[in-house]
Interface confidence: low
């Protein structure tokens, strides 16, 4: 049978390297040779390119090389397939070389801020060495912040006579490191170069862009004054590298703005001792370039009743995240403050906090929390300047098996009964929420038995034992990740009882 007609011919001119044409060969049953016929020099000349490979995938491509390729030019390309039964020709295809030229990528050599111009970086590059002198180049510049994965793109063109191979990328975040890549194409071409090597650059620093402010209210002291720990951090979306020289704080009783106190600090928290009434606290951060907008927080009076609206709350782990969800009875509350800290016996030193808006759930990457640590998580509803009653739960980002089993004792040994008691495992050793305990017991040389009880039970009575028999018993504490046995204890049931 005649060979299949070659279809889907496509040609690319790798500028100053070669012109490569490819096609779909069709299902060939016998050996087929392909010849690509070209006319060039605006139809004045013609030549052939013959595939000489025996592997079918390499036979669907053929290349013409320099010096017989120059831009601009018009080509016709036709592919002939030949086997023992005859020859079949493709359709004639027509190509303008400048429409199919593909260059090397440009080389970015410098990405820098322009001194004194905010939120901008200037990209300087070298045009590809092999690019048509007679054509303008078009460019796509793609950029992203260092810690982002999604690219933004901007397109522009450069005149071939333009010596200045620079582009000013504006509208960026201040004091932020960007990753830049550039590609180019002959203006008339549909083929883009590959992307250049990526280069980093940073925008200039600006005044801080803002703060988030929070507080921890402590019980009133004997003199009626109340310690309030103020906490603050850069506003969400602030440049990662944003530096602050210091903070300026001022506060006053809600009833009397004339009693304003001010202070400066370079720390990220501050302990205030306030009277029992309600207060307003305001603060700004500053650097050598200016001040941030003011952040303000209301501190309620000691006796002020806070509203309650969270009805139920639960935590679960899903896809490497700890997810906390809650239900609220107040539809007008749409901002919440989340506090979390490790549940350790000492005073919490590492309180973390974050606000959530327009949602009744909060997620945190598992790796931002220590595995096998219990965290206290509180959610505060916030309505305008009022902060509601928190709802608190405990959760683990990742559970493990307890690092030790329960400390076990045997009490009330009888003829056929015994009471097994055990202590709760210390918090630091639990590695997860204890969901149950399992009591394993076995008579010497006999069959083993087990009984599982829920985690609120710390003792269990074994019955129907054999009299005057040695038993071994141990208690296992389990989390969702598995269980750990306590030490095994031996006891012997009595031979008779005074009650028999």
């Amino acid at each position: 049978a005649l060979p299949a007609k070659p279809e889907n011919i496509s040609c690319v001119y790798y500028y100053r390297k070669n012109l490569t044409c490819t096609w779909s060969p069709g299902k060939e049953t016998s050996y087929t040779q392909y010849t690509v016929k070209r006319t060039y020099a605006f139809g004045e000349k013609h030549d052939n390119c013959t595939t000489n490979s025996s592997t079918s995938e390499n036979r669907a491509s053929c290349s013409f090389f320099l010096p017989r390729i120059t831009i601009p030019d018009n080509y016709t390309i036709e592919v002939e397939a030949e086997n023992g039964d005859g020859v079949i020709k493709s359709h004639m295809t027509y190509w303008r070389l400048e429409n199919i030229a593909k260059t090397e990528p440009p080389k970015i050599f410098r990405v820098k801020p322009v001194l004194g111009i905010k939120r901008m970086i200037q990209i300087e590059w070298i045009k590809p060495e092999l690019a048509p002198v007679s054509s303008d180049l078009k460019y796509t510049l793609r950029f992203r912040t260092v810690n982002s994965t999604s690219w933004m793109e901007v397109n522009f063109a450069k005149n071939r006579k333009d010596k200045n191979q620079t582009y000013n990328l504006t509208g960026l975040q201040p004091f932020t490191e960007y990753v830049i890549a550039l590609r180019c194409a002959v203006k008339e071409s549909k083929f883009w170069s590959d992307w250049s090597q990526e280069k980093m650059g940073m925008t200039e620093e600006e005044a801080p862009c803002g703060l988030e402010l929070w507080r921890v209210l402590k019980p009133a002291e004997a003199d009626g004054r109340r310690p309030v720990r103020l906490l603050w951090k850069k506003a969400r979306g602030a440049p990662v590298l944003e530096k602050t020289l210091g903070y300026n704080i001022w506060y006053y009783p809600e009833s009397n703005t004339n009693l304003t106190e001010t202070m400066n600090t370079t720390n990220q928290q501050l302990e205030l001792h306030l009277g029992g009434e309600s207060f307003w606290v305001s603060m700004i951060s500053y650097n050598s370039l200016g001040k941030s907008p003011v952040a303000t927080l209301r501190i309620p009076a000691i006796q002020e009743k806070s509203f309650q609206c969270i009805e139920v709350m639960q935590a679960c782990v899903a896809e490497d995240q700890l997810v906390v969800k809650w239900q609220s009875s107040a539809l007008d509350v749409n901002t919440w403050m989340i506090e979390w800290f490790p549940d350790v016996d000492s005073e919490p030193t590492t309180l973390s906090w974050e606000s959530v808006s327009q949602a009744t759930n909060w997620t945190i990457q598992q790796d931002k929390l220590k595995p096998f640590w219990c965290y206290n998580i509180s959610v505060y509803p916030m309505l305008h300047d009022k902060v509601g009653e928190p709802y608190s739960i405990q959760a683990y980002a990742k559970e493990g098996v307890p690092s030790e089993g329960p400390e076990t004792k045997v009490e009330n040994i009888g003829v056929k009964t015994v009471t097994i008691t055990w202590k709760e495992i210390p918090k630091s050793e639990r590695k997860g929420i204890i969901c149950n305990y399992t009591i394993f017991y076995q008579a010497e040389g006999g069959k083993g038995f087990s009984k599982t009880v829920n985690s609120s039970i710390l003792q269990y009575g074994l019955e129907s034992l054999k009299r005057k028999t040695s038993y071994i018993v141990q208690v296992m504490a389990s989390t969702s990740a598995g269980g750990t046995n306590g030490t095994s204890i031996n006891f012997k049931t009595l031979s008779f009882s005074v009650f028999e």
């Epitope: 080389k107 050599f109 410098r110 001194l115 004194g116 300087e124």
Partner: antibody
Framework: QVQLVQSGAEVKKPGASVKVSCKAS????????MNWVRQAPGQGLEWMGL????????SYNQQFQDRVTITADKSTSTAYMELSSLRSEDTAVYYC??????????????WGQGTLVTVSS | DIQMTQSPSSLSASVGDRVTITCQAS??????LAWYQQKPGKAPKLLIY???TEAQGVPSRFSGSGSGTDFTLTISSLQPEDFATYYC?????????FGGGTKVEIK
């Protein structure tokens, strides 16, 4: 023609500061970046930092970041380099050098005659 | 920071000799390299920039070559006034760094 004329030699005690000036003429002062480079006796060249006199923007070598301040006075076409907390190893000739930006960015096209700063107790 | 390594640190040559000094960058600096000449008690003088472009008024016996990380300064026929110390410097970005210098002395 383009000229950079620096202030005279200085002798300073350890811990003191020195301020070297560099007066430019023969070109538009605000159109070119000014660099400062130093050379300890018998040693090589060490770039300290630069200033864009047009807007006062600076860039410093990390090694000097905390001790060097480069400024420019547009009205007198003069650049200044101040080095604080001087120590004996700061004994060197300090040069100002104009950037040849038209020909190649960061090439030091025109140099001052140098100012010898001696730090000695 | 980009490190610049120059070799040799010194060499002896006679008038009329062809002299070659090399400079290596610790990373790709394309063709952004300058060469300076410094005579005792004087400020350095720009000879070559962009690896091979001669600065204004520099005699044609001075030539530069190379790109990427390896560069060469060649003096085709050494003249009496060429005995000096030569420094390479990358002009790729700040911070600018110089090579350690090559002292060309009379043999």
């Amino acid at each position: 023609q383009v000229q950079l004329v620096q202030s005279g030699a200085e002798v300073k005690k350890p811990g003191a500061s020195v301020k070297v000036s560099c007066k430019a003429s023969g070109y538009t002062f605000t159109g070119y970046i000014m660099n400062w480079v130093r050379q300890a006796p018998g040693q090589g060249l060490e770039w300290m930092g630069l200033i864009n006199p047009y807007n006062g923007g600076t860039s410093y070598n990390q090694q000097f970041q905390d001790r060097v301040t480069i400024t420019a006075d547009k009205s007198t076409s003069t650049a200044y380099m101040e080095l604080s907390s001087l120590r004996s190893e700061d004994t060197a000739v300090y040069y100002c050098a104009r950037d040849g930006y038209d020909d190649g960015p960061y090439t030091l096209e025109t140099w001052g005659q140098g100012t010898l700063v001696t730090v000695s107790s | 920071d980009i490190q610049m390594t120059q070799s040799p640190s010194s060499l002896s040559a006679s008038v009329g000799d062809r002299v070659t000094i090399t400079c290596q960058a610790s990373e790709d600096i394309y063709s952004f390299l300058a060469w300076y000449q410094q005579k005792p008690g004087k400020a350095p003088k720009l000879l070559i920039y962009n690896a091979q472009t001669e600065a204004q008024g520099v005699p044609s016996r001075f030539s530069g070559s190379g790109s990427g990380t390896d560069f060469t300064l060649t003096i085709s026929s050494l003249q009496p006034e060429d005995f000096a110390t030569y420094y390479c410097q990358h002009h790729y970005d700040s911070p600018l760094t110089f090579g350690g210098g090559t002292k060309v002395e009379i043999k």
